[in-house]
């Protein structure tokens, strides 16, 4: 390589580049450095991609875009602080005497270093979006933030249409001018300004750098406003909802932020770039050097070519943008990826029946009247699987699916969850744990691994908690081994006897009905209805209670619903839940109230599934804004998202039991959403579909 073309984005930077080129040339540093003038970082990235330039220093956000969209790689990193190397930490600071946590930021007053700045804006906003705390409709991040906080100071937001809320806490200069300016004229600008906004009580939380509080407290050389401040009077907000002392930033932060880095095309030799810059920094990074690589004072600007706070440049070992940025920062960036110019005009929803088409049409009209974005379009399909195919092909955008279909959508079609359904706390028909219940009996104690030849009670053939999950789990764990995919026979041979009520049996193994008792007259044995006294979840528990079976597979609430006076029927009126136990997957037994730790699986709620290229935050942002208007079944806005009775049907578009659409948070894949135990059980059952 004879020459190296550096891309600049302003006249002062072009001038500094030319000076650096001369300095390098004068020192005999090879290859020679040329300066290519671009108009912006985006323009420079395009020039590098088109081989019209070779290198530029970018911040984390730009490294992300350049890497993701153009395949550029980081090769040389800046170091600002010898202690923490090529990174720093974005933190959220609160006053110690407040009770704010990361989970209670809604409605709180916020202080930011400046609009679009890494630590003060990109990381906290991206983090809040990515974790589902903050929903963004139609890529309008400014509006979303303005609505989320109870007033903010975001210097630089004055030129936006949301300045009222985003500049509400800003003060300007001593004479009250330049309010919300993205410059030192705004007293709450930059790291120290954002902290001052918190310290003076204007805001309740400040988004700053890990070192900001320590640099502005405890009597160090400080501006007058900070003299009396003590670092111990402030705390950090941690991602898990806890708080920590200011010195705990390594473990309690929003994200580790990567330093700026020099990026080049993937086919370029990163080592060559570092050798060139390293020779340069050895000669030109001292205060008495004829040219100073890490200073921009001579050009009346800041951070030209490199950040002025750079102490040295170091080679990057793993030269890909993801490794350099790190998971925390990547997650935050994901939340900010929304580009209003790329927002699709429509979100095409998959519908599967005439009533669903009607409800979807009404939803589209209702959303449109309220100017919700993107607009809904309804597209018919023949089956959930057909929806999945159409979404994979890019012809449809979204569909709500149940557990088994979520698995198929993810595994076979690569779809991902964008939002989920939340059911009422007390609604156990939709959200529950699957448990194996036994009588408390010290003389006849067995574990989950010792179920062979025991007597089993099930609510009915195909019931999720009573059949699909426990049997699937036993198959997947190798206890039940069906021959020729004959699950029924395999189960009948595994247990000594069972009661598994069934409708319209054919070739049904008798031992699966052996424990069933029928009605009071002994008729209707094993039928899949209440005529069989051991049918359903309460019936399966009764089968255990009356000593017909040794184990019952139930929902975690079943025992409570039928004990301690909750069920007045003669068979249940005297029962105490304390007389029953749960069998745990680890071989232990537990009290029945320990269901969260001792269960076979948690039944996953339904999820809205989309193509992996679809921006999930846009989908959730739309649904979240919509449910504020249409989520309550008794709302007066002309449409009920979570009710289908008007269409003489049920569970159209969403389950009627839904109380809210919720963000996926960290459950960004179908496996995360379903949970490992449910997946194990499902794979056990699916392995037997010959």
């Amino acid at each position: 390589v004879m020459e190296m073309q550096w891309c600049t984005i302003s006249d002062p930077e072009q001038q500094k580049c030319k000076d650096m080129s001369k300095a390098f040339q004068g020192a005999g540093i090879q290859p020679s450095l040329l300066c290519v003038q671009g108009t912006s970082t985006d323009h420079c990235v395009q020039l590098i991609k088109d081989q019209k330039a070779d290198a530029i220093t970018l911040d984390g956000g730009a490294i992300y875009q350049a890497g993701k969209e153009y395949g550029l790689k980081p090769v040389v990193g800046e170091v600002y602080d010898q202690d923490i190397g090529t990174s720093y930490y974005a933190v959220a600071v609160v006053r110690r005497n407040s009770n704010v946590t990361i989970n209670t930021l809604k409605g709180v007053k916020s202080c930011h270093t400046g609009i679009n700045r890494t630590v003060g804006w990109n990381v906290p906003v991206g983090y809040l979006v990515e974790t589902g705390h903050l929903s963004v409709m139609g890529c309008d991040v400014l509006k979303a933030v303005g609505d989320y906080f109870g007033g903010s100071c975001v210097p630089g937001a004055g030129e936006t249409s949301h300045s009222e809320s985003l500049c509400r806490l800003c003060r300007g200069d001593s004479s009250g001018h330049n309010v919300c300016d993205k410059s030192p004229l705004e007293r709450y600008y930059d790291y120290s300004g954002a902290f001052r906004c918190l310290a003076e009580g204007a805001g309740d939380v400040a988004f700053v750098k890990h070192s900001t509080v320590l640099e502005n407290t405890d009597g160090k050389t400080l501006p007058s406003w900070g003299k009396a401040l003590m670092s111990q009077d402030f705390q950090l907000l941690c991602r898990d909802g806890s708080r920590a002392d200011i010195t705990e930033w390594r473990r309690c932060h929003l994200a580790k932020v990567p330093a700026h880095a020099v990026v080049v095309r993937d086919d370029m030799d990163g080592g060559l770039i570092f050798r060139l810059l390293n020779e340069g920094q050895l000669l030109f990074s001292h205060e008495d050097s004829s040219f100073q690589m890490f200073s921009s004072k001579a050009y009346g600007q800041k951070n030209l070519l490199f950040k002025d706070s750079t102490l040295e440049l170091v080679p990057i070992a793993t030269q890909n943008y993801e490794s350099w940025l790190g998971q925390e920062y990547l997650h935050a960036m994901k939340g900010l990826l929304c580009d209003p110019n790329r927002l699709p005009h429509y979100l095409r929803w998959c519908v599967l029946s005439v009533p669903e088409i009607q409800k979807c049409g009404d939803m589209a009209v209702a959303f449109s009247r309220q100017s919700l974005k993107p607009e809904i379009q309804c597209v018919s399909a023949e089956s959930p699987e057909h929806c999945m195919q159409q979404i994979q092909a890019g012809h449809i955008d979204a569909v709500t699916l149940r557990g088994e279909d979520i698995y198929r959508a993810g595994k076979a079609y690569g779809l991902v969850p964008a939002a989920g359904e939340l059911y009422a706390e007390e609604d156990r028909s939709n959200s529950y744990f699957v448990v194996a219940v036994v009588r408390r009996d010290s003389s006849y104690s067995f574990t989950l691994d010792e179920l062979r030849s025991k007597r089993s009670c099930h609510p009915g053939l195909g019931s999720p908690a009573g059949w699909e999950v426990p049997i699937g789990s036993l198959i997947q764990r190798g206890f039940i081994r069906p021959k020729d995919c004959d699950v029924l026979t395999a189960v009948s041979e595994f247990f000594n006897a069972s009661c598994v009520p069934v409708n319209n049996p054919k070739n049904y193994p008798s031992s699966l009905c052996a424990l069933c008792v029928g009605d009071e007259k002994g008729r209707n044995k094993c039928v899949g209805s209440s005529q069989e006294r051991y049918y359903g979840y309460s019936g399966a528990f009764r089968c255990l209670v009356e000593n017909a079976g040794d184990v019952a597979f139930l929902k975690h609430t079943t025992v409570f619903e039928n004990t301690n006076g909750h069920n007045p029927e003669p068979w249940a009126s005297h029962l105490r839940w304390q007389d029953y136990e749960l069998l745990c997957p680890n071989g232990a037994r537990a009290e029945v109230d320990q269901f969260q730790a001792c269960n076979l699986a948690q039944m996953p709620s339904h999820a809205v599934m989309v193509h992996p290229d679809t921006n999930i935050f846009t989908v959730y942002g739309l649904l979240d804004k919509a449910q504020d208007l249409f989520g309550d079944d008794h709302n007066k806005n002309g449409f009920q998202m979570f009710d289908s009775s008007k269409y003489h049907s049920q569970d159209l578009l969403f389950k009627d039991a839904t109380v809210r659409a919720v963000p996926v948070r960290e459950k960004t894949t179908y496996l995360d959403w379903l949970g490992p135990d449910y997946v194990v059980a499902l794979e056990g059952m699916l392995s037997q579909q010959c």
């Epitope: 021959k483 020729d484 995919c485 004959d486 026979t489 006897a497 049996p505 054919k506 070739n507 049904y508 193994p509 008798s510 031992s511 009905c513 052996a514 424990l515 002994g522 044995k525 010959c690």
Partner: antibody, heavy 118, light 107 residues
Framework: EVQLQQSGPELVKPGASVKISCKAS????????LHWVKQSHVKSLEWIGR????????SYNQIFKDKASLTVDKSSSTAYMDLHSLTSEDSAVYYC???????????WGQGTTLTVSP | DIVMTQSHKFMSTSVGDRVSITCKAS??????VAWYHQKPGQSPKLLIY???TRHAGVPDRFTGSGSGTDYTLTISSVQAEDLALYYC?????????FGGGTKLEIK
């Protein structure tokens, strides 16, 4: 009406093999298991095994697993039982029987008489 | 394998009489017991399953009872056409096994 029409009587020599057929009609052939049962004066009724016409999966009584082989031909709705290495003890009436709601014989064919004689 | 025992090889009765045929299993079969009758020159026909459930079309003079290991088929009023061999069978566990049969004779 469920009908199971079995093949006619067989007279075979010891050591030979025989194939008995059972043609089903009056229902969907692949919906129900087909069982085979041996009736002899010595041991009354003995269950030989069953076949699932849908996929050909079989289950045998251990004492017959080297004696009998069960197959089906879905296209003709016919089940077959091959009996090998015949001896006089195999002389009996052999029934095919269709399963019902539960997995055991409900409806029986008319039977096929097998005589094994030198 | 589960052994089903019908202790009476023959039972003699008159038309109009009530008769009970018994069957004992070598272990608890959880009421998974079927009864068949086989008339001379015919194939067996299912009468009862689950110890007491009558098969479609079976006259109500046939009733079954029992639990655990002991089972009974009762004909409340014997008819001439009931002359047959009666077999019990357990349908709890494969291999399905049959009793040796009880021959009902009309006096």
């Amino acid at each position: 009406e469920v009908q199971l029409q079995q093949s006619g009587p067989e007279l075979v020599k010891p050591g030979a093999s025989v194939k008995i057929s059972c043609k089903a009609s009056g229902y969907s052939f692949t919906d129900y298991y087909l069982h085979w049962v041996k009736q002899s004066h010595v041991k009354s009724l003995e269950w030989i095994g069953r076949i699932n016409p849908y996929n050909g999966a079989t289950s045998y009584n251990q004492i017959f697993k080297d004696k009998a082989s069960l197959t089906v031909d879905k296209s003709s709705s016919t089940a077959y039982m091959d009996l090998h290495s015949l001896t006089s003890e195999d002389s009996a009436v052999y029934y095919c029987a269709r399963g019902g709601d539960y997995d055991f014989p409900w409806y029986w064919g008319q039977g096929t008489t097998l005589t094994v004689s030198p | 394998d589960i052994v089903m025992t019908q202790s009476h090889k023959f039972m003699s009765t008159s038309v109009g009489d009530r008769v009970s045929i018994t069957c004992k299993a070598s272990q608890d079969v959880y009421a998974a017991v079927a009864w068949y009758h086989q008339k001379p020159g015919q194939s067996p026909k299912l009468l009862i399953y689950w110890a007491s459930t009558r098969h479609a079309g079976v006259p109500d003079r046939f009733t079954g009872s029992g639990s655990g290991t002991d089972y009974t088929l009762t004909i409340s009023s014997v008819q001439a056409e009931d002359l047959a061999l009666y077999y019990c069978q357990q349908h709890y566990r494969t291999p399905w096994t049959f009793g040796g049969g009880t021959k009902l004779e009309i006096k």
